[in-house]
Every structure is written in C-alpha cells, then in structure tokens.
Interface confidence: low
C-alpha cells in the first residue's frame, strides 16, 4: 500500500517514541564513531521533519524516501572525511548505491574503547537525572559496538534495561538488585547479537533462499501443527522482516515484525497451541517471546516420509514442476517430524535430497537411482550426534575453562594466522556449548549445540572477513553455510605454517593482574595459551598444561607476595626460562 | 513462492448459490490435496470441506453436506466450491489452504447470506 510520505506512514504506525529510538539505532549502525551528542541532535532534527510530514504529507521533501531522508542527514555531518575515511565517498552516490555503500562499511570489530560499568550509585544518579538521555545512551553505545544488532529487540532491551534501573535504584541495596540484572542483560545481548549476525550474513553472502530454508527448516519444528502454507506464509513474513533489518531499513522492519506478531496472534489455532503466554503481552514482549517459544508437540498421526517423497512414482515430476516448493514440503515435513536435530543438519539432509533428485531425474530409472536416497542421511545424522558425544564428554571432563583452553588449542593449530584475540574470543565462545548444552538431554543437544555452534563460527567468519589471514578460514566460511562446522573440524593442524618469532614481551606479565575479575584473568591466561600455540604448534597436550599449570601457580603466588611487581619481574623470567625449555623453544 | 488467490464471493440471498475459485500458484498444485475453510465474524475457523490431488476423493463437514460440492481443474490449478441452499449462518471469509487444515495462508472472499 503506497503511502505519499512513508516517513509520516511510519511515525504514525509507530509512534513517536519508538520512531526516535529507531532512528537514533540505525544513525549509530552506520556512523560508529560519532560522539552520543551528534546523533541525537539529527535524530531530533529528523523527528522535527517527521512530524511536519504527518501534519502535511505534501510537504517538501515528505515523499522522498527514508534512505534519501536518512542518507542526506548522515551525510551532513562536518568530520566524516576525518572521522570515517573512504566511507565519505558514499555520500557521492545515489540511492539505492549509497545506502548500499554506508551498509559495506559497517565495522563487526570498531575501534571503540571497552564499555565500563560505573558504580551503582553514579548509575542511579545519572538515571534519575536524566532519565531519556540515560536510556538514549544505552541504545547508542549497543547499537555503535552491534551494528547488525535486531533494532526492534534492542527496543525491548532498552525495556528491560529501563525496569531494571527503575526497580533497583529504590532498593536497600542497589548493587545486589541491579548487577546481576545487568550481567543477564549483557549476556543476552550479546548472545541476541551473534545471533542476528548470522541470519544477516545468510541473507547477504548466501542469498534469500538460504535463509528461507533456515526459516522453513526451524518454523516447521517450532509450529509441527501448522499446515505448509501456514508456515509459507510465516516464512515469507519473516524474510521480509529480516531483510529489512539487515539492510537498514530498521523502521520499516519494526513495522513489519509488529505485524507478523498480530497476525501469529490472530491465527494462534492454525499455527501454535504454545503462543497463548506470549500473545497476552505487550508488543515488545510478545515479539520477543513469539521468537523463544518452545517447540508445539508433533501431531501423533504423521505418516512416514517416503511415501511422498521416495515410494511416489510422482517424485521426479513433482520436483519438476516446482523445485523449490518441493524441496521446501520436503523439509516442512523432514523439520517438524525432527525436533532432535539441529536446523543445519535438516538444511544439509535437504540438499541431498536435492543433488540426489537432480541426478536421479534425469537418470533412466529415476526410481530404482533415488530408492536409497535416505540411507544417504545415515552417516549425516551420526557426525554431529557423535561430535557431540564426544564433546560433552570432554567438557564434563574438564569443566568450562579447561574445555575452553582444548578448544584454543584445536582452533589455534587449525587456523594459527587468525588474530590471537579472535581466536580467544571465538574459542571462548565454542567452550560455552558445554554449558549451554550439554546438561539437555539427547533429543535437544543437537539443536541446543549445533545452530550455536553456527553462530560462533560466524562470529569468526564476519571477524576474519574484515582482515582476511587464512585461506582455510576463507574457505570453510564462504563456500558452505550449513557445513561450515563440519569443515571447520575437519580441519587438522596446518602444516604449512611458519611459528611466530619468541617475544618474551608477549610473556610478560605484571601485577594489575592481581585486581582483574576472575573472567578477565581467564582470558590473560588464554591469551598466554594461544600465543604459546603460535609459537610452538607441535606441542604437545601434556607439555602444554604443564607449562599452564606453571603459569597458573605464578600468578597466585606472586597475587599473595607483599611486592607483587617484584614477584612478577623476577619469578616471570624464570616461568620464561621454564618454559622455553619445557616447549624446546 | 505459495499464492492461494480466492474468489466468487458476494451477497446472496438466502436460498441462492455461489460458486468460489481459488488459484494457486508456486507449488506443484496436482500432487496435494486441498481444503476449503471458513471464518464467520468473531469466530475461529472452520473447516468446510476437502478433495485429494486427483479429484476423486471428496469430504464435508456435516454442516455444508448434500449443499456444497468441491471440485478442483487440476490442467487450471484450480479448485471451486459451489454453494447451494445458502443460509444465512454460511456467512464466512472463505479461503483454501493446502491439505486438510484451518490454517490461513491467504486472504479469502467474503461470501454474505443475507435477505
């Protein structure tokens, strides 16, 4: 439905508030590095225009679009050339090119400096005084360092931030109620981040039909109830919704997910016997919750799969007819029988039917050639099941941070050229599946590990895209996106590989240590193990944990010494001298 | 992508006839069986009736039996409900879905029975 001015369309569909927050998001999204204060006074300056459209909607300039809108205002700020680089040359091209432009520079990795959390009190005080700048804030600082983060969730973030500090700075003790509110919420927003990140890089580097078949794949085993062109439609929706978000049309992307959300609400019967909790809140709410709902139970009555699609003489003309809606009915019906598998591994059972399907069919005996087609899927289903096995074996084993420090040193001799804080961070994130997953019983550990471990892989894929080092991390990440896990652990040690240079600097370590979180420690000391790695990657798993067990006593013993620099300077040469003879550095 | 297209709805009076088409398109129409259902005001949906791919199989609720025939013009990816002995609690949003569900994958047309 075509609007003379889709800015005034959007204000009133979305209200003044939400309006505002969005646009404020999608400015930080795009211009990383611009101080809070910048972008609120053009987010004000829009929101001024906004409002003169809804007044008049023939106005001047109220039929342009929003990227012309949003381009030209970007564009007026005075140190993009200083501040931003290459990227000012956006602002020399046209729209659709120039939106295009702003979104190829978008930054997984800015240089921004870590955020700090403030002392309780100085938080509550600066809430109380200020109570929108405080909220504007949070949304600045999350968008600049996310910039693919999901704009209408981070409104219910922004939410939940606001219930917290609202309920916490009146209590007794502030801290108690508000520190573990705020870790929740970093967490989860982080996790809501990575996760976003993967369905915009499936959109962006595999296309439309991959994420379509991500989406028919994880609805079907969410809503087994629904018919498929129930879940069709729901698709569809999705997509649009999704596409709109990682392109930067974030207002209309909010528009539309608060639609599918009325319209999920409305047909409930038709698609979930779950939804009722989630369709009796708020808009923020319901969104959000609509999104985690736990999977409907499977309708009792499913017949087997080979009827339709290996025993029916109709296959190969079926197929024919409409490939993709075929393929897509195979993979309703394969998802919703299968709430124990992991999307990728229903993506990947898909498209063996396809390559079968399409050999088949143009075989002499297309029957007699597909007839086995589902004892190809055998061997598929056992890799992760039995990957899995094995690694919750070893986290149970080992615990989180020693899982994590395996985990380091498998990646660091796969891919030894990616940045040591990336292979920190990615590994970090790979040993959280342990305790994410690992405590779920069997029919929910594939899909618990295995779409995340997707969803770490594409945090390495997005970081090393940025400043490409291994040709082995290029090809696992571009050339498959649902095997990208199998070919990341099909990755043995490389051997082409030249060891890093010793640099005792890299080694040395002083007494801030001491005052670090425990977390912070951890990863001092995985950087210690990466860079050890590095430097030596035939090292064995014993002489390794014998040089980390050192480590570990040498920082605890010089954290209890009365002169901890000293300790430090002193017993940190000798570790030095330990350990390069240990290693045979 | 799946497009169910309904139409042939109205006003009619009580007593008359309507005959509903629905068009599909973007899935191979032959090979799936094909529901009618319907929506009255304030109400959740019904189903109405339903045929298998090839045409020879038909079923009808009790309501609509012995009045409504559904059929389907596989060569026209088509299928049709004609309406007999309307009444007036046959006033729906009528719309087909896929298989044999309540589900709404499309918008419907508005069929009034009303004097």
């Known amino acids: 439905d075509a609007h003379k001015s889709e800015v005034a369309h959007r204000f009133k569909d979305l209200g003044e508030e939400n309006f505002k927050a969005l646009v404020l998001i999608a400015f930080a999204q795009y211009l990383q590095q611009c101080p809070f204060e910048d972008h609120v006074k053009l987010v004000n300056e829009v929101t001024e225009f906004a409002k003169t459209c809804v007044a008049d909607e023939s106005a001047e300039n109220c039929d342009k679009s929003l990227h012309t809108l949003f381009g030209d205002k970007l564009c007026t700020v005075a140190t993009l050339r200083e501040t931003y680089g290459e990227m000012a040359d956006c602002c020399a091209k046209q729209e659709p090119e120039r939106n295009e432009c702003f979104l190829q520079h978008k930054d997984d990795n800015p240089n921004l400096p870590r955020l700090v959390r403030p002392e309780v009190d100085v938080m509550c005080t600066a809430f109380h005084d200020n109570e929108e700048t405080f909220l504007k804030k949070y949304l600045y600082e999350i968008a600049r360092r996310h910039p693919y983060f999901y704009a209408p969730e981070l409104l219910f973030f922004a939410k939940r931030y606001k219930a917290a500090f609202t309920e916490c700075c009146q209590a007794a003790d502030k801290a108690a109620c508000l520190l573990p509110k705020l870790d929740e919420l970093r967490d989860e927003g982080k996790a809501s981040s990575a996760k976003q990140r993967l369905k915009c890089a499936s959109l962006q580097k595999f296309g439309e039909r991959a994420f379509k078949a991500w989406a028919v794949a994880r609805l079907s085993q969410r809503f087994p109830k629904a018919e498929f062109a129930e879940v069709s439609k729901l698709v569809t929706d999705l997509t649009k919704v999704h596409t709109e978000c990682c392109h930067g049309d974030l207002l209309e992307c909010a528009d539309d997910r608060a639609d599918l959300a009325k319209y999920i609400c409305e047909n409930q019967d038709s698609i979930s016997s779950k939804l009722k909790e989630c369709c009796e809140k708020p808009l923020l709410e319901k969104s959000h919750c609509i999104a985690e709902v736990e999977n409907d139970e499977m309708p009792a009555d499913l017949p087997s799969l080979a009827a339709d699609f290996v025993e029916s003489k109709d296959v190969c003309k079926n197929y024919a007819e409409a490939k993709d809606v075929f393929l897509g009915m195979f993979l309703y019906e394969y998802a919703r029988r299968h709430p124990d598998y992991s999307v990728v591994l229903l993506l990947r059972l898909a498209k063996t039917y396809e390559t079968t399907l399409e050999k088949c069919c143009a075989a002499a005996d297309p029957h007699e050639c597909y007839a086995k087609v589902f004892d190809e899927f055998k061997p598929l289903v056992e890799e992760p099941q039995n990957l899995i096995k094995q690694n919750c074996e070893l986290f149970e084993q080992l615990g989180e941070y020693k899982f994590q420090n395996a985990l380091l040193v498998r990646y660091t001799k796969k891919v030894p050229q990616v940045s040591t804080p990336t292979l920190v961070e990615v590994s970090r994130n790979l040993g959280k599946v342990g305790s994410k997953c690992c405590k779920h019983p069997e029919a929910k550990r594939m899909p618990c590990a295995e779409d995340y471990l997707s969803v770490v892989l594409n945090q390495l894929c997005v970081l090393h895209e940025k400043t490409p080092v291994s040709d082995r991390v290029t090809k696992c990440c571009t050339e498959s996106l649902v095997n990208r896990r199998p070919c990341f652990s099909a990755l043995e040690v490389d051997e082409t590989y030249v060891p890093k240079e010793f640099n005792a600097e890299t080694f040395t370590f002083h007494a801030d240590i001491c005052t670090l979180s425990e977390k912070e420690r951890q990863i001092k000391k995985q950087t210690a193990l990466v860079e050890l790695v590095k430097h030596k990657p035939k090292a064995t798993k014993e002489q390794l944990k014998a040089v980390m067990d050192d480590f570990a006593a040498f920082v605890e013993k010089c954290c209890k010494a009365d002169d901890k620099e000293t300790c430090f300077a002193e017993e940190g040469k000798k570790l030095v001298a330990a350990s390069q003879a240990a290693l045979g550095l | 992508e799946v497009q169910l297209l309904e139409s042939g709805g109205g006003l009619v009076q009580p007593g008359g006839s309507l005959r509903l088409s629905c068009a599909a398109s973007?899935?191979?129409?032959?090979?799936?069986?094909m529901s009618w259902v319907r929506q009255a005001p304030g109400k959740g949906p019904e189903w109405v009736s339903a045929?298998?791919?090839?045409?020879?199989?038909?079923r009808y609720a009790e309501t609509v039996k012995g009045r409504f025939t559904i059929s389907r013009d596989n060569s026209k990816n088509t299928l049709y409900l004609q309406m007999n002995s309307l009444r007036p609690e046959d006033t729906a949003v009528y719309y087909c879905?896929?298989?044999?569900?309540?589900?709404?994958g499309s918008q419907g047309t508005l069929v009034t029975v009303s004097s």
């Open positions: 973007g899935f191979s129409f032959g090979s799936f069986g």
């Open positions: 879905t896929i298989g044999r569900s309540t589900s709404r």
């Open positions: 045929i298998d791919s090839g045409g020879a199989d038909t």
